[in-house]
């Protein structure tokens, strides 16, 4: 009998509010034995896979997805899913990435919510919504403004 797979978690380092041009790393975590982690982004059809999975603890594995220079187009919700043979997990909650202008004028707030806000708690996707909708990926040529289509 196949085991029930725990939902992955997603976090961002150094946080979820990133200055334009700075780097951010999404960290996806799941149980040991994960073969592939996939990072998806809402409202985008692209995604990123990695099989570069490391053991974060005796009971947990993780993968890291880095964006070297964040642009406005990288803003929006991200989520993880993983493959542990012979099946895929459910998706994680979405984590919202905010991108702020570095040239803070007088109207710009000095601080914004950080990674302590954690994943945005949206209702779990229905089983037929696993692409609802998926990521844009992390390549520089894939830069679009984020729009909700729901």
């Amino acid at each position: 009998q196949e085991e029930d797979l725990p939902r992955p978690s997603i976090s961002a380092e150094p946080g979820t509010v990133i200055p334009l041009g700075s780097h951010v790393t999404f960290v996806c975590r799941g149980p040991v034995g994960v073969q592939t982690f996939r990072l998806e982004r809402e409202s985008r059809s692209t995604y990123n896979d990695t099989e570069d999975v490391s053991q974060a603890s005796p009971s947990e594995s993780e993968a890291r997805f880095r964006i070297d220079s964040v642009s406005e187009g990288n803003a929006g919700p991200y989520r993880c899913i993983y493959y542990k043979p012979p099946k895929w997990s459910e998706q994680s909650d979405y984590l919202e990435l905010l991108v702020k202008e570095t040239s803070g004028g007088p109207d710009s707030p000095d601080t914004e919510p950080g990674s302590s806000a954690g994943p945005t708690q949206r209702p779990s996707d229905n089983s037929h919504n696993e692409h609802a909708p998926a990521s844009q990926g992390l390549k520089a040529e894939h830069l679009y403004h984020h729009h909700h289509h729901h």
């Epitope: 592939t36 409202s43 985008r44 059809s45 692209t46 995604y47 990123n48 896979d49 899913i81 493959y83 043979p85 012979p86 099946k87 895929w88 996707d125 037929h128 919504n129 696993e130 692409h131 609802a132 909708p133 998926a134 844009q136 990926g137 894939h142 679009y144 729009h147 289509h149 729901h150």
Partner: antibody
Framework: QSVKESGGRLVTPGTPLTLTCTAS????????IQWVRQAPGKGLEYIGA?????YTYYASWAKGRVTISRTSTTVDLKMTSPTTEDTATYFC?????????????WGPGTLVTISS | ELVLTQTPASVSAAVGGTVTIKCQAS??????FAWYQQKPGQSPKLLIY???KLASGVPPRFKGSGSGTEFTLTISDLECADAATYYC?????????????FGGGTEVVVK
């Protein structure tokens, strides 16, 4: 890397028929596979898809008429009670690496003829 | 259910000319969109996806643009080999399933 359809043949109306899409040279578990058909002289018609995570989707006209299922190396399309209108070439296709929106890998197609 | 309206149904242009094909979606599909080329007796070939990225091996004479509900395929510097039928497709799997609908196709005749 390739996909190839098989199972197409001449059958009489109402005879169940299963088409198989076989993946070669890549790990099927990472990919969505769609089934598309083309009647003689007509355009492309979407039938449905099996997603990487194992879920299935169907065009509204296909619901109840076909069933899509997958194994680790194949994706099957079962036509439960075909009619003469189902005569067509059936294609399977795999989405492109890194993007669900485009299907870059297509099989040559398999011809299904439904006739009494 | 999602409908993709593709226009024109047929277009003719001279070698070296330019052809523009449009595809309109009845609902917003974001970037879940692709263009295909099909020649008689052959399988479809992916040209553009995402909806402005060029598929591998496709010359830059083919250009895709648009997002949401309006999409365009432009073929410039037409060659005889471009004579084919072109299809748009939505491949959106979302909260409201919109699916893998195809447009009706556009026959391109090169003179």
């Amino acid at each position: 890397q390739s996909v190839k359809e098989s199972g197409g043949r001449l059958v009489t109306p109402g005879t169940p028929l299963t088409l198989t899409c076989t993946a070669s040279g890549f790990s099927l578990y990472k990919y969505n596979i769609q089934w598309v058909r083309q009647a003689p002289g007509k355009g492309l018609e979407y039938i449905g898809a099996s997603t990487y995570a194992g879920y299935t989707y169907y065009a509204s006209w296909a619901k109840g008429r076909v069933t899509i299922s997958r194994t680790s190396t194949t994706v099957d399309l079962k036509m439960t009670s075909p009619t003469t209108e189902d005569t067509a070439t059936y294609f399977c296709a795999r989405h492109i690496d890194g993007d669900y929106s485009g299907y870059a890998l297509w099989g040559p197609g398999t011809l299904v003829t439904i006739s009494s | 259910e999602l409908v993709l309206t593709q226009t024109p149904a047929s277009v003719s242009a001279a070698v070296g000319g330019t052809v523009t094909i449009k595809c309109q979606a009845s609902q917003s599909i974001g970037t879940w969109f692709a263009w295909y080329q099909q020649k008689p007796g052959q399988s479809p070939k992916l040209l553009i996806y995402g909806p402005s990225k060029l598929a591998s091996g496709v010359p830059p004479r083919f250009k895709g643009s648009g997002s949401g509900t309006e999409f365009t395929l432009t073929i410039s510097d037409l060659e005889c080999a471009d004579a084919a039928t072109y299809y748009c497709q939505s491949t959106y799997f979302g909260v409201d399933y919109l699916g893998g609908t195809f447009g009706g196709g556009t026959e391109v005749v090169v003179k």
